[in-house]
Amino acid sequence: MFPFALLYVLSVSFRKIFILQLVGLVLTYDFTNCDFEKIKAAYLSTISKDLITYMSGTKSTEFNNTVSCSNRPHCLTEIQSLTFNPTAGCASLAKEMFAMKTKAALAIWCPGYSETQINATQAMKKRRKRKVTTNKCLEQVSQLQGLWRRFNRPLLKQQ
C-alpha cells in the first residue's frame, strides 16, 4: 500500500521539489540543485563506457535522435525517465550497469533524490521482467547517449 504519510508530508511542505505522479507510483525530482560537474565526471569516467558496451555491434548511424533536452536539469529529467521508466518494447534497462551507475550518480550528487526513489522501489519490484536486449532497447540507449552528450555541452544552443 502507498504510504499516505508521505503524501501528507509533501502536501504540507509546498516548498519541496517533489511532485507525486500516481501513475506507476513514481515520484519525480527537480534536478536543479545537482552537482552537475561531478555527474559529468562520473559519466565521462564510467557511465559512457558502459553505454558503449551495451551498444557494441550497433552502428552509430542506425538510430535517429528524437529525444532532446534544453539544459542540464532537463537533460537529467529525460535521462532518468528513459533509463528507469519501462516503455513499450523495452520493459526495463534498470538492471544494466550503466543504469545502476546513473542511479548512483543521481543519489550521490542530487540532494534529496534518494527520498523520491524509496516508494518507486516498491513499484519496481512488482514489475521485474526478464532481461532481454531488444532493438527497441538499443534505440532507447542510443537516445540516452544523445541526452548525455547534450548534458555535457550545456552551453550549446538548442537545435
Epitope: V9, A99, K103, A107, I108, W109, G112, T121
Partner: antibody, heavy 124, light 107 residues
C-alpha cells in the same frame, strides 16, 4: 547479507598516522558507499567522510579535510581510513558503516550495517 | 556543514511512557534524516530513514515525523530494551552530520 569487519586496535604517538581497514563480505562492494564515523570516549557520533567505490569518489567533513584520506580497493572489497597528524583528541572508536545502496532497487541514505569498531589510542 | 541540534540531551522515563525526541537542522534537508539507537559498547543501530520510514526489523513503537528543518522520533510505549542513546543524522547531499544525542534513562 553484508558484513563489515574492521582491523584491530591501534596505539599511536602524537603526530603520527593511523590506517584502519574495513573489509566487506556478502554483497556487491561497488553497489554501496562506505562511511567512517568516530566516537570519542563518552562522546557522541562524528561523521568523518564517505567513499563511493562505484566512482572512486570520496568526500570529507570540513573538520577533517586535509587530515583524513578514505580509499577503497574493489579487488579485496576493503575500504580504508587514514588519519594523519594525530593528537590526543583523536583517541576514539572508529566505525565503518554501509551507507545507502545504489543497485537496481534503490535504498536510502541511512547507515544500516556497521563494523565492530576499532579503538585508536593516541598517547605519548 | 549542516548543523543538527537535538533536544533534550537526556531524559528520564518509565516503562510504558511515551517518549519524544526532537531534532532541528540548520537548513532545509527535505526528509533526508535518519534516527539511530546506540547502547554502551555497541555500534549504532538504524531505526528510521527518510524521516519516517521504519527500518526492517525495528518494532513499530518507533516512529518518525517531520520535514524541512524539524523532526521528531517517538517511542509510543517505552520498553526495558529501549533505554539507550538516540542520535539523529542528516544526509542531504554528500555531507552528513549527527545530532549530539539524547540519553534515555530509567526514572
Amino acid at each position: 547479507q553484508v558484513q563489515l569487519v574492521q582491523s584491530g586496535a591501534e596505539v599511536k604517538k602524537p603526530g603520527s598516522s593511523v590506517k584502519v581497514s574495513c573489509k566487506a563480505s556478502g554483497g556487491t562492494f561497488s553497489s554501496y558507499a562506505i562511511s567512517w564515523v568516530r566516537q570519542a570516549p563518552g562522546q557522541g557520533l562524528e561523521w568523518m567522510g564517505n567513499i563511493y567505490p562505484i566512482f572512486g569518489y570520496a568526500n570529507y567533513a570540513q573538520k577533517f579535510q586535509g587530515r583524513v584520506t578514505i580509499t577503497a580497493d574493489e579487488s579485496t572489497s576493503t575500504a580504508y581510513m587514514e588519519l594523519s597528524s594525530l593528537r590526543s583528541e583523536d583517541t576514539a572508536v572508529y566505525y565503518c558503516a554501509r551507507y545507502g545502496q545504489y543497485g537496481q532497487h534503490f535504498s536510502h541514505g541511512g547507515m544500516d550495517v556497521w563494523g565492530q569498531g576499532t579503538l585508536v589510542t593516541v598517547s605519548s | 556543514d549542516i548543523q543538527m541540534t537535538q533536544s533534550p540531551s537526556s531524559l528520564s522515563a518509565s516503562v510504558g511512557d511515551r517518549v519524544t525526541i526532537t531534532c532541528r537542522a540548520s537548513q532545509d534537508i527535505s526528509i533526508s534524516l535518519t534516527w539511530y539507537q546506540q547502547k554502551p559498547g555497541k555500534a549504532p543501530k538504524l531505526l528510521i530513514y527518510g524521516a519516517f520510514s521504519l527500518q526492517s526489523g525495528v518494532p513499530s513503537r518507533f516512529s518518525g515525523s517531520g520535514s524541512g528543518t524539524d523532526f521528531t522520533l517517538t517511542i509510543s510505549s517505552l520498553q526495558p530494551e529501549d533505554f539507550a542513546t538516540y542520535y539523529c543524522q542528516q544526509y542531504y547531499g554528500t555531507s552528513a552530520t549527527f545530532g549530539q544525542g539524547t540519553k534515555v534513562e530509567i526514572k
